[in-house]
């Protein structure tokens, strides 16, 4: 069978037909439909939406659509015993209490089952004590407090502002500092853009708005009770004391009206510098405790949430490939939301829905993709990427043998300024070529390509005339596919012009105000940015599933490997004396990168020349491309993080959202000057260089001629 027999039309025409079928008006309708009530993981409402999506994907024409369920650990507030924080006087009387729920947005006052703001997986507890303000609660913030300012957080309740890093890292840092509770709040400096009104009159966070979110440190484990294995009917579950990643101290989030009341009384040390000041009219004193007049007052937390094993449902749709049905291209995004999910996730789910509809339309006209496309609506992403991870654990043997690529589809927008792409280097050329073929939706770029507007607004820091493409971190459903299984992955969305605030999210993130109206009134009234994101995500899936030769360029991996090796070497060279003392050499790593570069170059030449009409050779070359990402997986995983197995990339140990390159070496070098046993510490650096060099060399050899 020739490779073109999958289609009744020429490949170019197929892509055009697919893209032309995508309609902004449909995305708008789907978004409205998905956001009228809350769809919290583990609730009946989210199960009903799963069944609706299953039914609609079947109608759209997919070959099969199944629900895959798992019983995982989730967390909910106690309905009759609300969580809150008090200021108490010396008699123990509560003189101020934080709010019990957000004021509902206009039109939603009578909606039931809006979960109040809470930190998912917080243990129960009622700690009371003095407050310490810890800025963003980053590793460097605690270094500043403990090492420079000599402030001890042990036995204190810390208050940290949201932003910069994943909230779970903040809680982990606070725990390690000895805190007995954590209060998280949204400071207007991070969640209120100047010159924009608060919701419902604009897209800024009102004072009563609060960011929900999980505070786990799962490190890729999935369900905390069944790490490594699916949470199915016959699963063996750990006891709660052995569960992975649960916080050990109570945590609760608040808005900036309530934060003002706590922070305005703070005494103790002044903030160390201006980077510790937000935008509230408070001194941002670090503490500990309240100032003179209020020094006898304390803060008390009242947390009564419960962890419960609950059933969740993924929707898995299949469009069988005509030529290589055993090769899977996956498009997945989550369905569960904290409340209405106007942006997160339903702006993404609506785009996936329209992509499925378009593929279904082509299929009904007699077309099939060359490779199988799997579509997924994941559950319980907000509770720790649980739905995607459990499904991947259940299907890991199939995925590691057959997985070509995973394209993530969470929120389509976090702004309306320009495109943002994070992906494996294997996909750089695919993304560049695709965006050159798509029209830019941006004002002032009429008639220009998406590539052009993206490059102008978000230029690459290294290569002129090219756009920035970032490393994959985590905090979303690609994690298990990329970091654990080594399946080439990518994500794309429209973003804001706010580089300094990269990991803080948009102002209304995870609040009750993330509604359909937020998107329709303020972010994308014409749904043109949603359409563009649909074209990028859908176009990537189309090419990955339909191109005869996989659209991966291994030479781009060679380029970044050299860049990452240079970067980690320069970090290490900040300690020249120790490198000399302990005979630390990066020669093996640079040699492996050089070999990879040469072998990748030769492979690319062969890729241009081979006989594409020979299905065996074609399959062999494609398999080498498909398995290249897999070759960067170390079966033993990273130290203390067994489910982060990719040697080139891992989520930063200090911020789950950010990607780190050569993470094993990076972590071994981090704060090495403070290690009590330098010989052991530098020994670990050497071991990590060895692992990295071996892995790069081994990956290179998978691209060599097979015999």
């Amino acid at each position: 069978k020739s490779s073109n027999e999958a289609t009744n039309i020429t490949p170019k025409h197929n892509m055009k037909a697919f893209l032309d079928e995508l309609k902004a008006e449909n995305i708008k309708k789907f978004l409205y439909n998905f956001t009228q009530i809350p769809h919290l993981a583990g609730t009946e409402q989210n199960f009903q939406l799963a069944k609706q999506i299953q039914s609609q994907w079947k109608e759209f024409g997919l070959d099969s659509v199944e629900l895959a369920h798992y019983d995982v650990l989730l967390s909910y507030p106690n309905k009759t015993h609300p969580n809150y924080i008090s200021i108490i006087n010396e008699d123990g009387n509560e003189i101020f209490n934080t709010s019990l729920f957000e004021p509902p947005p206009p039109g939603y006052e009578n909606v039931s089952d809006i979960v109040p703001p809470f930190s998912a997986f917080s243990p129960q507890g009622m700690p009371e004590g003095d407050l310490v303000y810890v800025n963003y609660a980053r590793t460097e913030d605690f270094f500043k407090l403990e090492r420079d300012m000599k402030i001890n957080c042990s036995g204190k309740i810390v208050i940290a502002r949201y932003g910069k890093v994943f909230r779970g890292n903040k809680v982990k840092n606070a725990q390690l500092a000895g805190a007995k509770g954590v209060i998280l709040y949204s400071d207007p400096a991070d969640y209120f853009a100047p010159g924009v009104k608060s919701y419902p009159d604009g897209w800024n966070l009102p004072g009563g708005g609060v960011q929900r979110g999980n505070i786990l440190n799962l490190n890729g484990a999935g369900d905390p009770l069944t790490p490594g294995y699916p949470a199915n009917e016959y699963a063996y579950r750990r006891g709660i004391a052995e569960a992975v990643g649960l916080p050990s101290i109570p945590v609760h989030p608040i808005g900036y009206y309530d934060a003002q009341k706590l922070l305005e009384k703070m005494g103790g040390s002044a903030p160390p510098d201006s980077s510790w000041r937000g935008s509230l009219k408070v001194p941002y004193n670090v503490g500990p405790g309240f100032t003179g007049n209020f020094s006898t007052q304390k803060v008390k937390m009242h947390i009564h949430s419960t962890n419960e094993v609950t059933r969740i449902y993924n929707v898995i749709g299949t469009l069988r490939g005509a030529v290589e049905p055993d090769r899977y291209v996956i498009l997945g995004g989550h369905r569960d939301s904290w409340v209405f999910g106007g942006i997160d996730p339903q702006s993404g789910a609506a785009v996936v829905h329209e992509i499925v509809r378009s593929f279904g339309t082509l299929k009904k006209e007699g077309w099939r993709p060359r490779r199988t496309i799997l579509f997924a609506s994941w559950d319980a992403e907000e509770f720790g990427l649980l739905g995607s991870t459990e499904w991947a654990e259940e299907n890991s043997r199939l995925l590691q043998e057959r997985g070509v690529a995973y394209i993530n589809a969470d929120s389509s927008i976090e702004g309306n300024y320009t495109l943002r792409v994070d992906c494996t280097p294997l996909m750089y050329s695919l993304v560049h070529n695709l965006t050159k073929e798509l029209k830019s939706p941006d004002e002032g770029f009429e008639g220009k390509s998406l590539y052009e507007s993206w490059t102008k607004k978000s230029p690459s820091p290294e290569f002129s005339g090219m756009p920035r493409i970032s490393k994959l971190g985590s905090g979303n459903d690609f994690e298990v596919f990329f970091q654990r299984l080594g399946i080439a992955s990518g994500r794309a969305r429209y973003t804001k012009n706010w580089e300094t605030n990269k990991f803080s999210g948009y102002p209304l993130y995870h609040s009750v105000y993330e509604t359909y109206e937020l998107v329709e009134k303020f972010y994308d009234p014409m749904f043109k940015y949603h359409l563009t994101v649909a074209q990028v995500r859908g176009g990537m899936v189309f090419e990955l599933a339909n191109s005869i030769v996989l659209p991966f360029d291994c030479r781009d991996y060679a380029v970044v490997l050299r860049k990452y090796a240079d970067k980690i070497y320069s970090i290490s060279m900040k300690h020249p004396q120790e490198m000399k003392t302990y005979s630390v050499s990066f020669d093996s790593l640079f040699s492996a990168v050089k070999n990879f570069t040469e072998i990748a170059s030769k492979f690319s030449e062969r890729l241009q020349d081979f006989d594409k009409s020979n299905p065996i050779v074609l399959r062999m070359m494609n398999d080498q491309l498909m398995f290249l990402e897999r070759a960067f997986i170390d079966p033993l995983g990273l130290p203390d993080r067994p489910f982060y197995r990719h040697v080139i990339y891992a989520p930063s140990s200090h911020n789950k959202y950010a990607g780190e390159s050569f993470p094993g070496i990076y972590d071994a070098l981090f704060d090495i000057e403070s290690k009590v046993d330098p010989s052991k510490a530098w020994g670990e650096v050497k071991r990590q260089i060895y692992v990295a060099a071996f892995t790069v060399q081994a990956a290179a050899e998978t691209l060599s001629e097979v015999a």
């Epitope: 019990l100 957000e102 004021p103």
Partner: nanobody, 123 residues
Framework: EVQLLESGGGVVQPGRSLRLSCAAS????????MHWVRQAPGKGLEWVAV????????YYADSVKGRFTISRDNSKNTLYLQMNSLRPEDTAVYYC????????????????WGQGTTVTVSS
């Protein structure tokens, strides 16, 4: 259109109790802090009590602290004032009022929309 309808006033003897109600309509009651204010004959407005939109916080004027309790039922769009140990100086027209700003709690920034209900404390 915002409407606040107070009821429950009347004539009572000192030391007795009374419960005032205020039925709200025309705005999202659940999203606004609510106040009771009063005006004694021939005097200016006096703030009595405030409750946050969610009921988490309640604050009282010193003159009524320990005797009056403000509460609300968001499912019924109704505000209450339980008045115990009434004194002659509590004689006044009682108004319920809403906060001007969504989700905020301030003792002095409110709007009166109702006609009030009269409380007379006399032996």
């Amino acid at each position: 259109e915002v409407q606040l309808l107070e009821s429950g006033g009347g004539v009572v003897q000192p030391g007795r109790s009374l419960r005032l109600s205020c039925a709200a309509s025309g705005f999202p009651f659940i999203s606004y802090g609510m106040h009771w204010v009063r005006q004694a004959p021939g005097k200016g407005l006096e703030w009595v009590a405030v409750i946050s939109y969610d009921g988490a916080n309640r604050y009282y004027a010193d003159s009524v602290k320990g005797r009056f309790t403000i509460s609300r039922d968001n499912s019924k769009n109704t505000l209450y004032l339980q008045m115990n140990s009434l004194r002659p100086e509590d004689t006044a027209v009682y108004y319920c009022a809403k906060e001007r700003i969504f989700g905020v709690l301030t003792p002095d920034d409110f709007e009166i929309w109702g006609q009030g209900t009269t409380v007379t404390v006399s032996s």
